[in-house]
Structures are given as C-alpha cells and as structure tokens.
Interface confidence: medium
C-alpha cells in the first residue's frame, strides 16, 4: 500500500518455487537441509544435493511402508491405517523388518504357530 | 474421497500451533514449536492410497520412523565425511550411507529415487 517502488517494480514477479517442488518431492528439502546442518560439526558444511537426496530417501521409505500398510488395512477391510497395519506391513517384509528393529507400540504380534505344535487330527495329546 | 473421520488430517505447516499459555503470574509464555513430518507423510499416503486415512497413533509411529531413519543416515554420512577428511556432506556421502544402512533391494530402489530427485533438482535450477 503506497510503499516506495523497488528496483524490480516494473518486472513481473516470478513465483517462488520450493526446493521440494524443484526436485519433484513431497518431503521438505529446506527443513532437511537445516537438520543436516545442525547435526554436523561446527565447521562442517552440507551441500544442497545432500538435502535433496535425503528427502527423496525418506519419502521413498515412507511411501514403501504406507503402501504395504495401506494394503494390509484394505485386506482387513478397514479404511484407516493403524499401528497394527504398520506392524503387519513391516514384519511381513524381510527388508523392512531388518531395517526397523524397534517395537511398534500397539502393533500386536505376528500370527505364528510352530510346526511342532501342529499335530495331525485325532493325534491330540491328552493331559 | 475423504479420509476416515477419526483420522485427524495434519495441520498445515506440520508444526504445533504457537499458542500462548497463561502463566500464574499473568505473563503469557510461548509454547515451543514442535516440528513433525505429519503433513508430508499424509501427502505421500494420499499418493499411494488416495482413499485411506491414518490414525494419530499410526502417524506418530510414522513420524518416529522418519526421524529414526534420518538420524541414522545423517550420522553415517557425517562419519563418512569425517573419515574421508571432507568438509562438506554431499549427495555422495548420503548415497554411501544409504547403501551401508539399508538392506538389499531397499537400498537399490532408494538410491535410484535419490539420484532421480537430484537429477531433477539440478536440471531445474
């Protein structure tokens, strides 16, 4: 409102494009760059491509987990992903299982009956 | 289609609101901004399963997952740069860290996604 005309007042303003948009990502490249910088040593530097690469990795892994968890929820005819679906997705995938060793709160257990406990019908042990 | 009702859609900006809580002495104190990846996780979910929602507990788990993987990659990349006497962490250090940390096919696919994003980013500069 009535401020001084700046140097570029005649030129059409170009819309700011985020680094995430430029890389075709959903995850925040700028924020990840900031976090990377805060994690390095006092005089350590972080290149721009490191943040883009990291954001892409995090987004890919997120998509992979959500893809499998969403399928688990659909198999159980539920419209919303819960910790149980995350547990089934992660533990049901060899590679994700080895990557995520943490216990998932509210994830429950993976159904498993040891072979030795599955007796033939009619051969059940009597106590 | 709408996500399930009880799955609260994350707030824009993915930060908790900076509300001012009243202190006993009458002065207002700023509540700390807590950053999370909820907004981005939600966006990705809508790409892979447009008609599926996510519970707040599951979102919390996803947020912890992203933070955990980030810490592992950043830590490994930082160590690699230090060992190789490099003052800058580049996508090369991140890629090596990913290859060291992720198992088999997961690493292969992740590396391909990372390379693709960097290529797109550098070509659009």
């Amino acid at each position: 409102a009535g401020g001084k005309a700046g140097k570029d007042s005649g030129k059409a303003k170009t819309k700011a494009v985020s680094r995430s948009q430029r890389a075709g990502l959903q995850f925040p490249v700028g924020r990840i760059h900031r976090h990377l910088k805060s994690r390095t040593t006092s005089h350590g530097r972080v290149g721009a491509t490191a943040a883009v690469y990291s954001a892409a990795i995090l987004e890919y892994l997120t998509a992979e987990v959500l893809e499998l968890a969403g399928n688990a929820s659909k198999d159980l005819k539920v419209k919303r992903i819960t910790p149980r679906h995350l547990q089934l997705a992660i533990r049901g995938d060899e590679e994700l299982d080895s990557l995520i060793k943490a216990t998932i709160a509210g994830g429950g257990v993976i159904p498993h009956i040891h072979k030795s406990l599955i007796g033939k019908k009619g051969q059940q042990k009597t106590v | 289609p709408e996500p399930a009702k009880s799955a609260p859609a994350p707030k824009k900006g993915s930060k908790k609101a900076v509300t001012k809580a009243q202190k006993k002495d009458g002065k207002k104190r700023k509540r700390s901004r807590k950053e999370s990846y909820s907004v981005y996780v939600y966006k990705v979910l809508k790409q892979v399963h447009p008609d599926t929602g996510i519970s707040s507990k599951a979102m919390g788990i996803m947020n912890s997952f992203v933070n955990d993987i980030f810490e592992r990659i950043a830590g490994e990349a930082s160590r690699l740069a230090h060992y190789n006497k490099r003052s800058t962490i580049t996508s090369r250090e991140i890629q090596t860290a990913v290859r060291l940390l992720l198992p088999g096919e997961l690493a292969k696919h992740a590396v391909s996604e990372g390379t693709k994003a960097v290529t797109k980013y550098t070509s659009s500069k």
Partner: nanobody, 123 residues
Framework: QVQLQASGGGLVQAGDSLRLSCAAA????????MGWFRQAPGKEREFVAA???????TYADSVKGRFTISKDNVKNMAYLQMNSLKPEDTGVYYC??????????????????WGQGTQVTVS
Amino acid sequence: QVQLQASGGGLVQAGDSLRLSCAAAGRSFSSYAMGWFRQAPGKEREFVAAISRSRGVTYADSVKGRFTISKDNVKNMAYLQMNSLKPEDTGVYYCAATSSGSTRQLSTGRSNYWGQGTQVTVS
C-alpha cells in the same frame, strides 16, 4: 484373484521394436504392481521391468532406455514397449503381479501371480 495372459511376442530383427501386452482378469487391478520377467534358454528367469500402483517404474540395467513399461487401469492391461531389440533380449517373457503395490517386492520375484509366457526371438 488375478489371472494374467501375456501376448505380443514374435520373431523380429535386431534393432526392431515389439510391444508386449498383459491382460489381467480379476478385481482391484489398479492396486497391483505389475511387472515383466524373461527367461532365456538355459538361464534363470530374470527381472525386466515393473510398475507400481503409484510410485512409478523400475527397470533392469540391461533394458534401461530401451524398454518402457506402462499400465492401463481402465482396460486392466500392462504393456512392455521394447525398442532397439538385441539378440540377447531373446527369451520367454512373463508378466507378473503382486497385491503389495511395491515394485521392490515384485522385482525380487515375490510375485503373487504369474501369466504364461510369450516367446520373443531377436535374430
């Protein structure tokens, strides 16, 4: 749950193109990751290309830049466009699907469903 039928194979010259089709019968085709594998005479079945439900495509290094995989969720079809064919592309091509929408799971051969093969011969 999903039946797959591959077609479009044939005998072509080196440098020619060919388009393979995979027709899928069954429910919720759009949620499947689809892929192509091939088996050359006397060799093991190998991964060629895959397309996920949402996250794009992945290719074997040997076909990158020459082959293109695509998917039509309306027609329940998956395609493999093969350009600049080489004699080493000869083999039986199989289409595959997995109910996990993940190309990674498909590319490791953990497919739930397989189609019968279609022969591609490059002379």
